[in-house]
Interface confidence: medium
């Protein structure tokens, strides 16, 4: 807390300008009117205040707006945003995408801080859903943003927003997140033709069920091994050797290099060795000829 002291004669600030950088902390407290500061916040960013001086300016705004800053002030916080705590930010009502962009710009190049996470949370809650423009903005600043959301939060993403998602935005998503995103992507891209559709849906396929993989295998998509390795194991297991061959096309040769890794390893164990041999890749570990294959999942469903 800064002690309340009278402003020295002639030092009362008439506007927010560079002369204030020479003010001591107590002089800033005594001589800068909080209402003046609020109306000229856009100037603060252009003045090289020290962090200590910024603390004083923040304190003045906190006193003026104990219930939280208005958006007209928030939009022009600039580097003062770095002084805010998540508790401060929880009091805000941020509705303008321009405000969000301005504050994200301040934090650009840094990891997502608790302040930024709180800001985004407040913004998205205020909007009611994660619309395309917001998603565009957030993934531009934080490519991993989408995968930081819970499946519950992702459920509020409208299918139209999926157009804003780039493959790298999904790099760190787990199967539960793709579970929610895949059907939205399918809905968003369904009017595209076969090859264009596959290019768009490819990064979401970690949420695809077996039936969709079977359908894709009929469409000459030539899925690469990196995508195949990200598919859900339970979705891959029921695929036949012929279906996997059609799904991968020329990339089928890559199975050999991945034969010890999931889902390839588990898939091999479910295939007849004779069928695997037709691929000519030397894949080993299939069911020997003459053995009976029991579908245990069907048995469990019936019991």
């Amino acid at each position: 807390e800064v002690e309340k002291t009278a402003c020295p004669s002639g030092k009362k600030a008439r506007e927010i300008d560079e002369s204030l950088i020479f003010y001591k902390k107590w002089e800033l407290e005594a001589c800068v009117d909080a209402a003046l500061l609020a109306t000229q916040m856009d100037r603060v960013n252009a003045i090289p205040f020290t962090y200590e001086q910024l603390d004083v300016l923040k304190h003045k705004l906190d006193e003026l707006y104990p219930q939280g800053y208005p958006e007209s002030v928030i939009q022009h916080l600039g580097y003062l945003f770095l002084k805010m705590s998540p508790e401060d930010i929880r009091k805000w009502n941020v509705t303008s995408l321009e405000t969000l962009k301005a504050l994200l710009e301040v934090n650009k190049g840094h990891e997502m801080s608790p302040q930024v996470a709180t800001l985004i949370d407040r913004f998205v809650k205020g909007r009611g859903q994660l619309d395309k423009d917001t998603l565009d903005t957030l993934t531009a600043f934080y490519p991993g943003y989408l995968c930081s959301l819970s499946p519950e939060e992702l459920s509020s993403v409208p299918p139209s927003s999926i157009w804003a998602v780039r493959p790298q935005d999904l790099d760190t998503c787990d199967p539960r997140q793709l579970d929610v995103l895949y059907p939205k992507a399918r809905l968003a891209f369904q009017n595209m033709n076969g090859s264009e559709y596959f290019v768009k849906i490819q990064s979401f396929l970690g949420g695809a069920p077996t039936e969709d993989l079977k359908a894709l295998s009929q469409q000459n998509v030539s899925m690469d091994l990196a995508t195949f390795m990200k598919l859900r194991t339970d979705a891959v297991l029921p695929l036949t050797v012929a279906e996997v061959q059609k799904l991968l096309g020329p990339h089928v040769e890559g199975l050999k290099a991945e034969e010890r890794h999931r889902p390839v390893r588990d898939w091999i164990l479910r295939q007849r060795q004779d069928d695997l041999d037709t691929l000519g890749l030397g894949l080993q570990g299939g069911i020997p000829n003459g053995y009976l294959v029991l579908d245990l999942s069907m048995q469990e469903a019936l019991s």
Partner: nanobody, 121 residues
Framework: QLQLQESGPGLVKPSETLSLTCTVS?????????WGWIRQPPGKGLEWIGS???????YYNPSLKSRVTISVDTSKNQFSLKLSSVTAADTAVYYC??????????????WGQGTLVTVSS
């Protein structure tokens, strides 16, 4: 073309459990990607309640999570919603929703026509 129809009591007493069923016709419920519930309180926007996915995973709105259960009965071509400890704030039009098309090349999101549930003693 899937058709969805909500059914259940239109009036529920405070602190009781709201139970709604959604009956699916025009196709098999097991060919859907997900089944979900959404509500709209009078004069307010839509609020997602929760969804159950093809994989069996269930996701609920965090603000309702402790009170919600969604389940699917494929043998009856139905899915249901249970919301416990209701208050007047749970008064809303409740919609069931589903997305069809597992294994198909086109897909669509279907909604029921909605049913008004009033919580009052």
């Amino acid at each position: 073309q899937l058709q969805l129809q909500e059914s259940g009591p239109g009036l529920v007493k405070p602190s009781e459990t709201l139970s709604l069923t959604c009956t699916v016709s025009g196709g098999s419920i097991s060919s859907s990607y997900y089944w979900g519930w959404i509500r709209q309180p009078p004069g307010k926007g839509l609020e997602w309640i929760g969804s159950i996915y093809h994989s069996g995973n269930t996701y609920y709105n965090p603000s309702l999570k402790s009170r919600v259960t969604i389940s699917v009965d494929t043998s009856k071509n139905q899915f249901s919603l249970k919301l416990s400890s209701v208050t007047a704030a749970d008064t809303a039009v409740y919609y069931c929703t589903s997305q069809d098309g597992v294994g198909a090349t086109t897909t669509e999101e279907y909604w029921g026509q909605g049913t008004l549930v009033t919580v009052s003693s």
